[in-house]
Structures are given as C-alpha cells and as structure tokens.
C-alpha cells in the first residue's frame, strides 16, 4: 500500500464537471485560495480559455471564453 | 485508507511489449489526475506519464514518447501505461501516483525487466 | 527540458544535526518545487510542495525555501527515522526530478 501523506494536490478540477462551465465555476471558488501562473506544462490544457493554477490544490483550472464551457473548455455551449 | 496497486510487470525481451494497471481505492479516482513514474535499479526517479481526471490530457516524457500510452478507466477505478517497443533501459520498477504536479500517494510499484 | 542538479550526492551526518540540502534548476520555475523522501525498498513521500508548503503529516523539523532557480530543504534536527534518500521535482516544464541525495548516518 502508498504511504499515508494527505494531498494538497486534490486533482479535482474546480470546473471539473462536464457540464459545468468553468468561469463560472471558478469564480465561485475564489474563498478557496488564490491563484498562478499555471506551470509551462499545462499550457495547452485549456482549449478555448485561459489556464490558472489552485495555488491550494496545485492543479490547473480553466476559465472559459465566452461561449465556451467544459472541463478544458472543449465544447460549445448551446446555450450561449 | 488511499491505496494504488500496481500490476503487469515481469520479464520481456527487447521490442516487445506490456501492459502495466493501478488499481486505485479509498478516494474519489474519477476526480484526480494519475501519473507514472519509475526507477531503474539503483538510480533516481524518472516522471514517465500523467493523464487529467477526464482521460481526455495526456503527456510524455521524451523517453517513451511514441512508444507508450497512458490511459484510464474511471468505471474500474484502474489507470494503465500500454509500453511497446521496450528497450533494456526501460528496466525499472514502475509506480503509479496521484497527482499530476505532485505525487501525495505512491504505489509499491511493480517491475519490468526488459532483458534478452 | 529543465535539469535539476542536487547537492551534495551524499552526507553523512548525527542525530541532532542540522541538515541541508540544495536543489538548483538549470532554468527559473518560480516556485514549482517538491522534495520528497525515500527509504530502501519503500515508495516515495512527499514531504514539501511549492518550494515551502509543509505537506499535511510530515514533521516540522522539515522546511523548503527557495524561488526561481535554488531551492534549499533544512532539516533542522535530524532524526533516526531521517536517514533516507531525498529528490526535489520540478512542476513547471514537464516534471523532472533531482538526482537524489542519500543521508547516511555518520
């Protein structure tokens, strides 16, 4: 079995869900903690929509352009 | 309690291939990028793989770029690592890891000898 | 890619001492530094994430300092449990780790 160490890496998206959209989701998360620069890796991680890093929870989130919505940012939103 | 259980590894000539699984439980798997990382025999850690929550980013290191593929199955709770065109310098044990970034929890790990 | 190059390699040292070991990134990564700790046959563990975040559990004597290329991991008094293998990794560019450095006892 790993070792027993708790993450500050919680991995779970802030805009994690499909069908959520990821401004949105993010800006209700800004309580949680503040935000950088993603690192270099992560640079196309976002698809159509902006990177940032969860400084409390070192991932990456997306912050959706308009008329965008997703996980990465990856889908249309029908709705828009 | 978390726990990441890795499988598949043994012996395989040069060439040939393998397939490595994690079995992860005691956490919400679907939420949390996995990674893997290995070790040759006495040496240092060497990053290998990540994939996001959604199976949907992947990425490399420029060692095994085009000869393995990270993959995910969040109905089994199981991460993969498809290794073909094994060299002997592949020869390491293979852990899986949560994080993309940061690995909080390891595997065990399990070794893969490539060897004639 | 960026390379992380450890020092020293090994040390010998007592129980009590302060120990530090220093970790420079062949280019700047902000603060995109962990330092992990790993005993013979055992996994990993984290122990510092984001060049001086304590990782949850992992004992105070345990700091990081450091930005931008050098990074420096202190434990101030160290322990019999301490003796170990110690690796920073880079999250910036793709994640590489440090060559190691192995604390042994003096």
């Known amino acids: 079995d790993g070792n027993s160490t708790r993450s500050p890496e919680t991995n779970g998206l802030l805009c994690g869900d499909p069908e959520e959209n990821c401004a949105a989701t993010t800006t209700q998360s800004k309580r949680k903690g503040h935000f950088s620069r993603c690192p270099k890796q992560y640079k196309h991680y976002c698809i159509k929509g902006r990177c940032r890093f969860v400084v409390a929870e070192q991932t990456p989130s997306c912050v959706c352009d308009e008329g965008y919505i997703g996980a990465r940012c990856e889908r249309v939103d029908l709705f828009y | 309690e978390v726990q990441l259980l890795e499988s598949g590894g043994g012996l395989v000539q040069p060439g040939g291939s393998l397939r490595l699984s994690c079995a992860a439980s005691?956490?919400?798997?679907?939420?949390?990028?996995i990674s893997w990382v290995r070790q040759a025999p006495g040496k240092g850690l060497e990053w290998v793989s990540y994939?996001?929550?959604?199976?949907?980013?992947?990425n490399y290191a420029d060692s095994v770029k085009g000869r393995f593929t990270i993959s995910r199955d969040n109905s089994k709770n199981t991460l993969y690592l498809q290794m073909n065109s094994l060299r002997a310098e592949d020869t390491a044990v293979y852990y899986c890891a949560r994080g993309g970034s940061l690995f909080d929890y390891w595997g065990q790990g399990t070794l893969v000898t490539v060897s004639s | 890619d960026i390379q992380m190059t450890q020092s020293p390699s090994s040390l010998s040292a007592s129980v009590g001492d302060r120990v530090t070991i220093t970790c420079r990134a062949s280019q700047g990564i902000i603060s995109y530094l962990g330092w992990y700790q790993q005993k013979p046959g055992k996994a990993p563990k984290l122990l510092i994430y984001?060049?001086?975040s304590l990782q949850s559990g992992v004992p105070s004597r345990f700091s990081g300092s450091g930005s931008g290329t050098d990074f420096t991991l202190t434990i101030s008094s160290l322990q019999p449990e301490d003796f170990a293998t110690y690796y920073c990794q880079q999250y910036d560019a793709l994640n590489t780790f440090g060559q190691g450095t192995k604390v042994e006892i003096k």
């Open positions: 994939i996001d929550s959604w199976g949907s980013y992947t």
């Open positions: 005691g956490f919400t798997f679907s939420r949390y990028w």
């Open positions: 984001a060049a001086s």
